[in-house]
Interface confidence: medium
């Protein structure tokens, strides 16, 4: 179920940290690759990704979005295919660039 999927993200939540709008990472050839440590969920087209199970999906935070968050930390929420910034205190905005 979704509970397992969401819990599998293992992303900490801090009420004091303001994090802004999720951004869709650019599509690339790895987008459809399954991640080995994620629980089952329905993939588009019904494919279960058996051949790709042990190939780790690239985290856009380590590539295209490496310097995206100005005053914050980039986080990739895989089940939503989305990048978000965890802003440092007092900073806000999509890229934590506003104070």
């Amino acid at each position: 179920g979704l509970n397992d999927i969401f819990e599998a993200q293992k992303i900490e939540w801090h009420e004091s940290v303001r994090v802004e709008q999720v951004v869709k990472p650019p599509q690339n050839k790895t987008e459809s690759e399954n991640t080995s440590d994620k629980p089952k969920r329905k993939k588009k087209g019904g494919k279960n990704g058996k051949n790709r199970r042990n190939r780790k999906k690239k985290n856009p935070c380590n590539a295209e979005f490496q310097n995206f968050c100005i005053h914050g930390e980039c986080k990739y929420i895989e089940h939503l295919e989305a990048v978000t910034c965890k802003c440092q205190q007092e900073y806000f905005g999509e890229r934590c660039g506003e104070k």
């Epitope: 969401f6 939540w13 303001r18 969920r41 588009k44 989305a82």
Partner: antibody, heavy 124, light 112 residues
Framework: EVKLVESGGGLVKPGGSLKLSCAAS????????MSWVRQTPEKRLEWVAT????????YYPDSVKGRFTISRDNAKNTLYLQMSSLRSEDTAMYYC?????????????????WGQGTSVTVSS | DIVMTQPPLSLPVSLGDQASISCRSS???????????LHWYLQRPGQSPKLLIY???NRFSGVPDRFSGSGSGTDFTLKISRVEAEDLGVYFC?????????FGGGTKLEIK
């Protein structure tokens, strides 16, 4: 201004199929997960489907699993719901809804904007 | 599935009065991450539902501060401090802690 406009509803016989569309504007469509929710003639709300931003992951309740398929075209800013093997209990107003508010850590998004809905009637 | 119960079906109020709408879930809505994913929507006559409150007590953008949400575990309340004409309609609670997402049957706020 966030705007969601549903279309494609109508009258269909039991066992038939229908494809609903939802045209989105006023926000970066490709950045948001999206959902379909329906409202029965008795005015009860029922979650129907959710799709991730790129369309890779889709989620359904058991009541529609295997019969309904949610999809999206980010280039066209459009969300779809393909419904097949329709039953009388699928008769409802179908709403397209954006998943938000987008705050980090809120994995279980509330539906922050809804369209006006499109009516589906399944009857012989 | 989680059952969301909203008594009463109808709540008659006078404009300017305080209104209190309750919602009860069949299981605790506290998620393992510590958050409680209980939301409130208002559906005005002839309109689609609008988000008022998310995660128990957070007012959505543009929602007046006369609306407030509270509660924990299985019991939740939406309060309207001074009811205005535009507040009339059906209020739905909804949970997204457990799958499938479920909604209450709604409470209709109407003029006494």
């Amino acid at each position: 201004e966030v705007k969601l406009v549903e279309s494609g509803g109508g009258l269909v016989k039991p066992g038939g199929s229908l494809k609903l569309s939802c045209a989105a504007s006023g926000f970066t469509f490709s950045s948001y997960p999206m959902s379909w929710v329906r409202q029965t003639p008795e005015k009860r709300l029922e979650w129907v489907a959710t799709i991730s931003t790129g369309g890779t992951y889709t989620y359904y309740p058991d009541s529609v699993k295997g019969r309904f398929t949610i999809s999206r075209d980010n280039a066209k800013n459009t969300l779809y719901l393909q419904m097949s093997s329709l039953r009388s209990e699928d008769t409802a107003m179908y709403y397209c809804a954006r998943q938000g508010p987008i705050y980090y850590g809120n994995y279980y998004y509330a539906m922050d904007y809804w369209g006006q809905g499109t009516s589906v009637t399944v009857s012989s | 599935d989680i059952v969301m119960t909203q008594p009463p079906l109808s709540l008659p109020v006078s404009l300017g009065d305080q209104a209190s709408i309750s919602c009860r879930s069949s299981q605790s809505l506290v998620h393992s991450d510590g958050n409680t994913y209980l939301h409130w929507y208002l559906q005005r006559p002839g309109q689609s539902p609008k988000l008022l409150i998310y995660k128990v007590s957070n007012r959505f953008s543009g929602v007046p501060d006369r609306f407030s949400g509270s509660g924990s575990g299985t019991d939740f309340t939406l309060k309207i401090s001074r009811v205005e004409a535009e507040d009339l309609g059906v209020y739905f609670c909804s949970q997204s802690t457990h799958v499938p997402y479920t909604f209450g049957g709604g409470t209709k706020l109407e003029i006494k």
